[in-house]
């Protein structure tokens, strides 16, 4: 998932990493009233052969892992991506300065897998 | 999606790439009777800021792209992964040499996005 990194060493296997995101850090504090931030988390790590059960791999990812093994120049490894995402409720100002409470889907990573 | 590569240049944006997979190439020819192979396809490319509408990005991916922009050493870019997968039907021999027709889910990539 990080193709712009040069890394010759073994990365850890695909998993969920904790990450707290502050809306102020994103520059969104002027329109988001609450919360001040949230535990977004993210996915990172290797999807290498052989994929084990913990990696929540799709059938396609299993096939792609084998093809990558034989053709690394042409076909990438499957990537470590969210498999379960949760929503959060956000209180914010709309364009007319009305206060709105809205549920934003797919904001929090709950689980990761090889896709 | 290819963190074990060295690449100093801009990659193309996340998209679906065509890939035909032969079951003989995977070494599965002794148990899969039909088909001989299938168009599996795969996803590859960059999920860089700003994510446009073609990239089928989740809300989390949009947040992660911004966090990566500010903290590239710690948080990777979202990765280019399948957003739509199709099944294929496979005729195969089971462990008791019975011929079975089974639908295998998530075998064909139909669309890709930033996750």
């Amino acid at each position: 998932s990080a193709s712009d990194y040069n890394s010759s060493e073994l990365k850890t296997a695909c998993r969920k990493h904790e990450l707290y995101v502050s809306f102020q850090d994103l520059g969104w504090q002027d329109w988001i009233i609450a919360p001040k931030g949230y535990a977004a988390n993210y996915c990172d790590g290797e999807c290498s052969f052989p994929l084990n059960a913990h990696m929540n791999a799709t059938n396609h990812a299993i096939v792609q892992t084998l093809v990558h093994l034989m053709n690394p120049e042409y076909v990438p490894k499957p990537c470590c991506a969210p498999t379960k995402l949760n929503a959060i409720s956000v209180l914010y100002f709309d364009d007319n300065s009305n206060v709105i409470l809205k549920k934003y889907r797919n904001m929090v990573v709950r689980a990761c897998g090889c896709h | 999606s290819a963190s074990d590569y060295n690449s100093s240049e801009l990659k193309t944006a996340c998209r679906k790439h065509e890939l035909y997979v032969s079951f003989q190439d995977l070494g599965w020819q002794d148990w899969i009777i039909a088909p001989k192979g299938y168009a599996a396809n795969y996803c590859d490319g960059e999920c860089s800021f700003p994510l446009n509408a073609h990239m089928n990005a989740t809300n989390h991916a949009i947040v992660q792209t911004l966090v990566h922009l500010m903290n590239p050493e710690y948080v990777p870019k979202p990765c280019c992964a399948p957003t739509k997968l199709n099944a294929i039907s496979v005729l195969y021999f089971d462990d008791n040499s019975n011929v079975i027709l089974k639908k295998y889910r998530n075998m064909v990539v139909r669309a890709c996005g930033c996750h």
């Epitope: 093994l69 034989m70 042409y74 | 240049e9």
Partner: antibody, heavy 118, light 106 residues
Framework: QVQLVQSGAEVKKPGASVKVSCKAS????????IHWVRQAPGQRLEWMGW????????KQSQNFQDRVTITRDTSASAAYMELSSLRSEDTAVYYC???????????WGQGTLVTVSS | DIQMTQSPSTLSASVGDRVTITCRAS??????LAWYQQKPGKAPNLLIY???SLESGVPSRFSGSGSGTEFTLTINSLQPDDFATYYC????????FGQGTKVEIK
């Protein structure tokens, strides 16, 4: 015709670097990967690394501990292999070779002799 | 890395002979095996790919067989042009070559 043409023989001192070129013609350069393989006198062929000529992704064998850099220039339809911190054991013929997906090396350069001697 | 072992290292034969070279992989490589011919001062030349498929332009006296870990290159009716060194190569996981078999005139 379809060919890979490599640069000429080189003599280098220990500790120096060498850069070997491999110019492709007769096919679409950017649709294949170029690999580098070397052969020391009387030894088996040894794989060194690859570059995809289209997207520029590359990877090197761990045997060379970051001494190998593989690059390419699409405008010149050429790939390059640079080997640094040369030692006498690096004396060998260096080959570039083309590889398609699901295939072995189907086209080779003529080879470049690199001699490392003080 | 997958290790490739060829036998014999040297083979003495005469024109018209049937010659067999064996290659063993340290683990299963399915049919991802190639055979190359190399003459002194020249680059290797692909003969066989996917264990048994003949490369375009290669004479039909060359044939390959095997799968998994055991592979064979056979030259039926050896010709004067066939005296050379032959290498097997696996391309299942990374790329490794056998140590070579030199076919020399008896």
């Amino acid at each position: 015709q379809v060919q890979l043409v490599q640069s000429g023989a080189e003599v280098k001192k220990p500790g120096a670097s060498v850069k070997v070129s491999c110019k492709a013609s007769g096919y679409t350069f950017t649709s294949h990967a170029i690999h580098w393989v070397r052969q020391a006198p009387g030894q088996r062929l040894e794989w060194m690394g690859w570059i995809h000529a289209g997207n520029g992704n590359s990877k090197q064998s761990q045997n060379f501990q970051d001494r190998v850099t593989i690059t390419r220039d699409t405008s010149a339809s050429a790939a390059y292999m640079e080997l640094s911190s040369l030692r006498s054991e690096d004396t060998a013929v260096y080959y570039c070779a083309r590889r398609a997906i699901m295939a072995p090396f189907d086209l080779w350069g003529q080879g470049t002799l690199v001699t490392v001697s003080s | 890395d997958i290790q490739m072992t060829q036998s014999p290292s040297t083979l003495s034969a005469s024109v018209g002979d049937r010659v067999t070279i064996t290659c063993r992989a340290s683990q299963s490589i399915n049919n991802w095996l190639a055979w190359y011919q190399q003459k002194p001062g020249k680059a290797p030349n692909l003969l066989i790919y996917k264990a048994s498929s003949l490369e375009s332009g290669v004479p039909s006296r060359f044939s390959g067989s095997g799968s998994g870990t055991e592979f064979t290159l056979t030259i039926n009716s050896l010709q004067p042009d066939d005296f050379a060194t032959y290498y097997c190569q696996q391309y299942y996981s990374s790329w490794t070559f056998g140590q070579g078999t030199k076919v020399e005139i008896k």
